[in-house]
């Protein structure tokens, strides 16, 4: 018996087609992805093959103005239209709190939404009961297939699930649910979830009875043969893990942003054992036409987005200096504003010993692309912020050793004075540079804001200590020459859309007046620029 698994993960609000790098589509003939194009391909496969499941491994939420405006209603609507068979909860599904998950998505989805390792307690238990499930048995042709869901147990640090959801260890939570499926005589079981490729492989190895793992969170691109676009494969598709009980378990993921549709064919014997598995992600490029009816629906929903982007979010009573003449040479108040917003977006009081789990932010000055003039009645709109942050990136959470941070700050000024983008803006960090010293030895003071304290204060950076830092995904991926971050990071979790983070902060504050306040200093009285 043959099953075709179609899968997406980490789509992050890319409902419309995008450019090759998953930013805004400019030249339509070169654009990729989007739900209209995805639907064309899915329908083509459904018509051609008998037993097809379309699965999503989480993080549909967060990433473009679509989510900012529609808050998840767009996810339910278009996933229903595409007839997804099941979805696992990702960490970003909790970005607007539990209510922001329940009302727009859990109550509106016409398909099962799954997670076996999230347990509700207190008053939430009855409110959310039945709205998501640990597993779902799906009828596929004359057979049944069990889908068991899982979600990153780091979600309380990455999003806003509140205090009434407990995120258990994935493997511990999955095993009894898989066992329960076995007692229901379900002998073909897919683990569908959002904990990253390393955990996907562990689940394949450790959870007895799981036949296939379909994952997300780490944006992992797997491919067999010559890859069709810019993504470099982390391994073959499917990635085969030998389980502790000796079975070959295929593990798949489909990069991110709806650029690819995962396509995996599994052959089962009559006892539900995997005989063979093969496939590859399908690049959703312009050779695949956009479905006209879905496209028309997208265009209808789009109208509200254009209206939103010109509405006032809040006001500034000071000039927001995002000029390259400032942000690439010295502390600029636009950099301070953005870093303050990044920290504010990551406030999670999950431990009494810590005022917050993260206090530091770094931001490449080259990522700040425009100032905002306060002499327009002080008005700040989404459109204004899109000019400041036009690349459609995210502000991510990483864990780094102090020594890596020191290298990053040395890199920040290694060729100072050439208006290059690597000059770092900061939050929760006080840095002093001495530009008279040779490159690689210019950081003379680096103090960081404590987290395990009731009164936050600045202490010298410790080289061997592990620190959490919020930074743009561009830096986490080694952009602007920050190879040491990419090479040495100990953990990397994708965060919220950059513009959304700043817009939410401005809306919350109502009136802003960021200052230049001595976060970045130069010793030896260097007056540059």
């Amino acid at each position: 018996w043959e099953l075709t698994i179609l899968h997406t993960n980490d789509v992050h609000s890319r409902l419309e087609q995008t450019s090759e790098d998953s930013s805004k589509c400019v030249n339509a003939s070169r654009c990729m992805g989007g739900v209209a194009r995805l639907f064309t391909k899915v329908q083509q496969i459904r018509r051609a093959e008998p037993n097809v499941l379309l699965l999503d491994a989480g993080d549909q939420y967060q990433g473009t103005i679509w989510f900012t405006v529609y808050k998840g209603a767009e996810v339910a609507h278009f996933m229903n239209a595409l007839r997804y068979d099941a979805m696992a909860l990702g960490n970003h599904e909790f970005d607007n709190g539990v209510e922001g998950l329940i009302e727009p998505l859990l109550k509106e989805a016409k398909f099962p939404i799954l997670s076996a390792n999230i347990k509700a307690k207190g008053p939430l238990a009855s409110q959310i009961s039945g709205l998501y499930l640990p597993y779902k048995v799906l009828p596929v042709g004359d057979e049944v297939v069990g889908i068991v869901g899982y979600t990153s147990k780091e979600t309380p640090f990455l999003s806003n699930p509140g205090t009434n959801l407990v995120f258990e260890d994935e493997i511990t939570a999955l095993q009894p649910e898989v066992d329960k499926l076995k007692t229901l005589n379900v002998n073909k079981i897919i683990a569908l979830g959002h904990s990253g490729f390393e955990m996907d492989k562990l689940i394949a190895q450790k959870v007895r009875g799981v036949d296939v793992v379909v994952g997300g969170h780490s944006n992992t691109f797997l491919y067999t043969g010559n890859p069709p676009s810019k993504e470099v494969p982390a391994g073959k598709y499917p990635f085969i893990v030998t389980s502790d009980d000796g079975r070959k378990v295929p593990v798949v993921q489909a990069y991110a942003f709806g650029k690819y549709l995962g396509y995996l064919k599994i052959e089962f014997d009559e006892r539900g054992n995997v005989i063979s598995s093969h496939g590859n992600p399908i690049l959703l490029n312009s050779s695949i036409p956009e479905d006209p009816s879905i496209k028309a629906d997208i265009n209808k929903w789009r109208i509200k987005l254009d209206n939103y982007s010109t509405q006032e979010l809040g006001k500034t009573i000071v000039y927001l200096d995002g000029s390259s003449q400032s942000c690439r040479f010295r502390e600029c108040n636009m950099g301070n504003l953005i870093c303050d917003a990044m920290i504010n977006n990551n406030l999670r009081h999950t431990d009494e010993m810590f005022w917050n789990h993260v206090s530091m932010c770094i931001l490449n000055g080259g990522g700040i692309r425009s100032p905002i003039d306060e002499r327009n009645n002080g008005t700040i709109t989404w459109e204004n912020l899109a000019a400041v942050l036009p690349f459609g990136g995210t502000f991510d959470l990483v864990q780094l050793k102090g020594s890596t941070l020191k290298k990053a700050f040395e890199h920040s000024v290694h060729r100072y004075g050439q208006s290059t983008g690597e000059f770092l803006q900061v939050g929760g960090i006080h840095v002093v540079y001495d530009l008279s010293r040779k490159p690689g030895d210019r950081v003379v003071k680096l103090d960081v804001l404590c987290t395990k304290c009731r009164v936050p204060s600045y202490d010298p950076l410790k080289m061997d200590e592990v620190y959490k830092v919020i930074l743009p995904n561009f830096l986490a991926n080694g952009g602007d020459g920050f190879q040491m971050i990419k090479d040495e990071l100990l953990r990397h979790d994708s965060g919220d859309q950059d513009i959304n983070v700043v817009s939410t902060y401005i809306s919350k504050m109502k009136v802003i007046y960021p200052a230049v306040e001595g976060r970045i200093k130069f010793s030896h009285h260097h007056h540059h620029h």
Epitope: A109, K110, F111, P112, S129, L131, K136, V137, P139, V144
Partner: nanobody, 124 residues
Framework: QVKLQESGGGLVHSGGSLRLSCAVS????????IGWFRQAPGKEREGVSC????????NYADSMKGRLTISRDNAKNTVYLQMNSLKPEDTAVYYC?????????????????WGQGTQVTVSS
């Protein structure tokens, strides 16, 4: 809390009719496919009928085709099963079940929520 409650069962003579109701609470009915099942003493539970979440698709067991009509009233959060020309072999406990999914199925395992059942007895 999700709850399904069957009613309308009872004792009926061969050739008679019954209308079973399945009242659901704790969720909006229009997102759920509802199935009717029956279990006679000493036998496996078997699918009788089903109506998809959109209401556009219905299924009937071969053994009862032409004698059943399934319908749903989303406003009342209730699904009905009209059973005509009943036979003694239709005697069983009738259950309704719900699953959040688009498609009908007669497979017991795919349904997530079940009612307690209502007894239907057809005398000759």
């Amino acid at each position: 809390q999700v709850k399904l409650q069957e009613s309308g069962g009872g004792l009926v003579h061969s050739g008679g009719s019954l209308r079973l109701s399945c009242a659901v609470s704790g969720f909006a009915l229009d997102y759920y496919t509802i199935g009717w099942f029956r279990q006679a003493p000493g036998k496996e539970r078997e699918g009788v009928s089903c109506i998809s979440s959109s209401g556009s698709s219905t299924n009937y067991a071969d053994s009862m085709k032409g004698r059943l009509t399934i319908s749903r009233d989303n406003a009342k959060n209730t699904v009905y099963l009209q059973m005509n020309s009943l036979k003694p072999e239709d005697t069983a406990v009738y259950y309704c079940a719900a699953q959040r999914y688009y498609y009908c199925s007669d497979k017991v395992a795919v349904y997530d929520y079940w009612g307690q059942g209502t007894q239907v007895t057809v005398s000759s």
